[in-house]
Interface confidence: low
Amino acid sequence: MRWCLLLIWAQGLRQAPLASGMMTGTIETTGNISAEKGGSIILQCHLSSTTAQVTQVNWEQQDQLLAICNADLGWHISPSFKDRVAPGPGLGLTLQSLTVNDTGEYFCIYHTYPDGTYTGRIFLEVLESSVAEHGARFQIPLLGAMAATLVVICTAVIVVVALTRKKKALRIHSVEGDLRRKSAGQEEWSPSAPSPPGSCVQAEAAPAGLCGEQRGEDCAELHDYFNVLSYRSLGNCSFFTETG
């Protein structure tokens, strides 16, 4: 019952973010990331440059709620995602058994007091196939369209070379030179693999939500904030900020 109330309240917060005073914080995210179909990925956000108290973090995909970590109630995973979504590490979210349908925008929504709501955006692309970097946990993504284009170009060039070889042998060197230059250019333009999940820049003031610390004072502070739902402090999640 409490989670039902919380879900209703959470949606309300998204639509009408709290805004009491200047919001100085920033959300750093893993940005645009890619992963292989069937694999796992960690989505991570990091709230920094504010001393605001984090009271709840929502993870959403487009307009679907994936998970909530609430300071009183701990983690809640939406029933429709419970088989594929797991909490952590940290305030992050692990998506497992990825499908192409998981491609899209993900949002971490930090509800803070007194600042209000901070939202971070991550774009996840789930690829049909990718080349695994030896020994790495996460796959190095390849841009499918780019690879396909490169194959088509190479094939076309090879065909042209084969057809013209008999007639104009001297032009072969020129075509191969062009191909080498084109390949080199393609490599330079090709984006490098994204940083590993969570490797955002650590800001000077970096509050993080921590679950599991039995800090009564933090939970007590939340009573006023959550009193509309008449929460009883369970001490499950203690979100507090660090400023140095």
């Epitope: 983690w75 419970k82 590490p89 305030l91 921590l210 599991g212 610390e213 499950n236």
Partner: antibody, heavy 118, light 107 residues
């Protein structure tokens, strides 16, 4: 207070299986991952993986896939780890530990000593 | 996998000394590093989380610092009860990994 109580020492034969339990109390069991950590005699700590009791989701260290299987019984707030096809390499102390949102293990079980005999 | 290289592997110091243990991650782990103390025959105990935050009940002579790939655990005014093995652990990505440990002895 928060406690993780593990089952007692086990002496099993090579090739057999063993199920280790970890009973949680003092907090909402379904809100935190239960991790399993291995420590061989005189050696360091090795993360095996975790299970999230709220959903049953699991995360395995690739090294232990096929060796360890995690389950939970929410009604008794107990997590279990089944270790199969045991060899002498599996002789170790196995800890359960709670993993919350802060990227750390804040509460640990007392450890279960597993001895695999040939 | 992220490798955690801890040094030194063993350390001998006198009571009252200040000692430093370092932990180097093979890739950027931001501040997602914890330190644990394990006394002989005992369970690991959390000392520091998020690189520099003291866990509840841990004496203030323990401190942690660092971010990115380099981290240190400092124990000032060494006490007899500090005899233990100390481990670092990264929480940046799976699999979660620990350092090899630093065994601290009193001279």
């Amino acid at each position: 207070q928060i406690q993780l109580q593990q089952s007692g020492p086990e002496l099993v034969k090579s090739g057999a299986s063993v199920k280790i339990s970890c009973k949680a109390s003092g907090y909402t069991f379904t809100a935190y991952c239960i991790n399993w950590v291995k420590q061989r005699p005189g050696q360091g700590l090795e993360w095996i993986g975790w299970i999230f009791p709220g959903s049953g989701s699991t995360n395995y260290n690739e090294k232990f896939k096929g060796k360890a299987t995690y389950t939970v019984d929410k009604s008794s707030s107990t997590a279990y780890m089944l270790l199969s096809s045991l060899t002498s390499e599996d002789s170790a102390v196995y800890f359960c530990a709670r993993y919350g949102l802060g990227h750390y293990f804040d509460y640990w079980g007392q450890g279960t000593t597993l001895t695999v005999s040939s | 996998d992220i490798q955690m290289n801890q040094s030194p592997s063993s350390l001998s110091a006198s009571l009252g000394d200040t000692i430093t243990i370092t932990c180097h991650a093979s890739q950027n782990i931001n501040v997602w590093l914890s330190w644990y103390q394990q006394k002989p025959g005992n369970i690991p105990k959390l000392l520091i989380y998020k690189a520099s935050n003291l866990h509840t009940g841990v004496p203030s002579r323990f401190s942690g610092s660092g971010s990115g790939t380099g981290f240190t655990l400092t124990i000032s005014s060494l006490q007899p009860e500090d005899i233990a093995t100390y481990y670092c652990q990264q929480g940046q990505s799976y699999p979660l990994t620990f350092g090899g440990g630093t065994k601290l002895e009193i001279k």
